[in-house]
């Protein structure tokens, strides 16, 4: 008669490497009497005998995983017990090896020049695959702008036109290599004016051709505005070559005007706009104003009545035939544009435009418009209307998205005088100081001027009608 013998595992479990979808077997050879009951666990959880993913044979001594999945990774143990002595256990690891697999491949991307592009490439595999990228037929080199992230994604900062092309990602480990399909990176470029129209001083009844050239991807369209309205007369000729559009507006001149060339292209649902303006004035138009560019007078209009100080003298530009009507028409057009902007921006922008088109005026031998203090111009740009002016940030273009402000003339902040240099040399905007407490700490200004604590909207160094182009920087 055989003597009872406690179980002894004669073949301890070892680490098993297995490829996904292949078979993996653990062997747990046991000597004992009577025959032991052998059970198996994975990560300390009992494997059920009826689980069809496993096969348990040889009285429980062989555990086979019939088709390995990546989730089968873990510690497998066999436990043998026959009632004699204690149960015995042996454990081994299953390491699931996997050829590289691209789980989130890159997709075609359209991106605006100057922004950041990320092409995804999420991978699986064991050992962890290394990810590289191919552009066209060549391996892509990383640099200060281009980096392959830990996730495998490709990040391109400050996207340039030359980044456009076909890309694919490559995932590689010791077991193999996986390639994504080719994807296209298309770089769109904001509309930008290459050649602005030039101002002209002509005799009554002459013909003038204003030329405006713009570039962008997609190719922009060009429209012309005369004193704030669509051009009513004149002929337009256009040609397109190598993403450059050339527009020529021929005019028969019977009155002075401010002509604005507006180049627009579309990026998804948004538009980018660039603009440049030129004046057409008539020689000897008004002999009485020959030596001055304008005069000081009380504002008698309606649009800016609530914004400008009561009875204030403002500057009227005599390059217009009828300055008061022309400037009122311009502000009226601008006012309509402002309907689309945010409630935070709108009153600030209204103050900006009114003080810009109707600058505070110092009467004297030569009437002089007073520009707005630079810091208040910056406040409108950076604080009150930050979102609306976002498209102005790119150094290459001068227009705005269609945020409701895309046609508005705005001054170039950096060219305005600073309130820190000469507080009496620039104007401030009442609305901004009134509102500033609700938004952020905002500068209060010491000055000998009565409106010292009141910021006034930015004004440009030259009057509106004379300046050939506007931007905010």
């Amino acid at each position: 008669e055989k003597l009872p013998k406690a179980p002894v595992i004669t073949t301890p479990l070892e680490t098993v490497d297995a490829l996904v979808e292949e078979v993996a077997t653990f062997m747990c050879a046991v000597e004992s009497y009577p025959q032991p009951e052998i059970s198996w666990t994975r990560n300390k959880i009992l494997i059920k005998l009826f689980d069809t993913r496993y096969s348990i044979r040889e009285n429980g001594q062989l555990l086979t995983i019939l088709s390995v999945e990546d989730s089968d990774d873990g510690i497998y143990c066999c436990i043998a017990n026959n009632g004699v002595g204690g149960a015995v256990e042996s454990c081994g690891a299953l390491q699931v090896k996997m050829k590289p697999k691209i789980t989130r491949p890159p997709i075609n991307v359209k991106i605006i020049e100057g922004l950041k592009a990320v092409l995804p490439c999420t991978t699986m595999g064991n050992p962890k695959p290394s990810v590289s990228w191919i552009k066209g037929d060549n391996a892509l080199r990383e640099n200060s702008r281009i980096a392959v992230l830990e996730s495998g994604s490709l990040r391109i900062h400050n996207v340039q036109k030359e980044d456009a092309g076909q890309y694919r990602c490559v995932a590689k480990n010791s077991l193999g290599t996986a390639y994504s399909k080719l994807v296209k990176l298309e770089v769109e470029v904001f509309a930008r004016i290459l050649r602005a129209p030039e101002s002209h001083n002509v005799t009554f009844g002459s013909f003038v051709t204003l030329r405006c050239t713009a570039i962008g991807i997609p190719v922009p369209t060009i429209s012309w505005i005369e004193n704030g309205n669509a051009v009513s007369s004149g002929s337009i000729q256009e040609s397109v070559k190598d993403r450059v559009i050339d527009s020529r507006l021929q005019l028969f001149i019977t009155k002075p005007g401010l002509y604005t060339c507006i180049a627009t292209n579309k990026h998804g649902e948004k538009f980018s706009t660039a603009k440049a303006a030129a004046t057409v004035s008539i020689a000897e138009w008004s002999k009485s104003q020959k030596d001055s560019q304008g005069y000081c007078a009380q504002y008698r209009g309606e649009v800016c009545d609530a914004v400008l100080a009561k009875d204030a003298l403002v500057f009227f530009n005599t390059s217009y035939r009828d300055p008061e009507d022309a400037q009122e028409l311009l502000i009226h057009t601008a006012w309509n544009e402002l309907k689309a902007v945010s409630p935070l921006c709108r009153p600030a922008a209204e103050a900006l435009l009114c003080n810009h088109l109707f600058q505070e005026c110092s009467p004297g031998v030569v009437p002089t418009p007073m520009p707005i203090c630079r810091e208040y111009c910056l406040a409108v740009k950076e604080l009150f209307c930050a979102k609306e002016w976002q498209a102005m940030e790119g150094k290459a273009h001068r227009g705005l998205y269609r945020s409701g402000m895309h046609l508005l003339p705005v001054p170039e902040c950096s060219k305005l005088p600073s309130m820190h240099r000469d507080p009496t040399a620039c104007t401030r905007l009442p609305y901004l100081d009134y509102k500033k407490e609700n938004i952020t700490t905002f500068p209060s200004i010491t000055s000998s001027r009565p409106s010292a604590d009141i910021p006034n909207l930015p004004a440009s160094t030259s009057s509106f009608a004379v300046s050939p182009a506007y931007s905010m920087t």
């Epitope: 950076e382 005088p417 600073s418 820190h420 240099r421 000469d422």
Partner: antibody, heavy 124, light 107 residues
Amino acid sequence: EVQLVESGGGLVKPGGSLRLSCAASGFTFSSYDMNWVRQAPGKGLEWVSSISSSSSYIYYADSVKGRFTISRDNAKNSLYLQMNSLRAEDTAVYYCARDSYDSSGYYLRPFDYWGQGTLVTVSS
Amino acid sequence: DIQMTQSPSTLSASVGDRVTITCRASQSIDNWLAWYQQKPGKAPKLLIYKASSLESGVPSRFSGSGSGTEFILTISSLQPDDFATYYCQQYNSHSWTFGQGTKVEIK
């Protein structure tokens, strides 16, 4: 890296002239207002002159008005100080310094970067 | 021109001390005041602007306070690198002016 390098200092007789230059690099020079500040040997700092980014606005200290001229060439990333009718009291280290605005965009940070200075000695 | 007066002219202190320097303006300058640190033979360095805004990269032991005509620069715990001359400067209007300087030396 922002760098300002002054040059043109030296020994000059009273009544003489000198032209200082400041070469700027590491930033968009044409977007910033620039200044000259001086420091007499063993003394404190004195602001001399300022020029706006587009040269539209120029300011001088009363002590140099009519004698000194500030200018800039944005194409060459350079700032200049033409000093005429020099006096002994103009002897100092002359620094060029930049003004900028903080990240909010509208708070001035005066003289946020300085050059190493150039010594001007006015003596007979 | 606006006159700026600093006190004291010289200050002797030890490492770890809390140090305060006062700057007075001859008329109100709101909070348009900057503080600079200068070491011998070197250019000044901007520490504080707008009276209390810390310039990027400047240690947080430096702080500024005040508005109107009275301003204070505080170094909460003096470090060996802080022995230098400190200047205040107003930039409220046209002619920007500096204080005469405060020299912080080792006691």
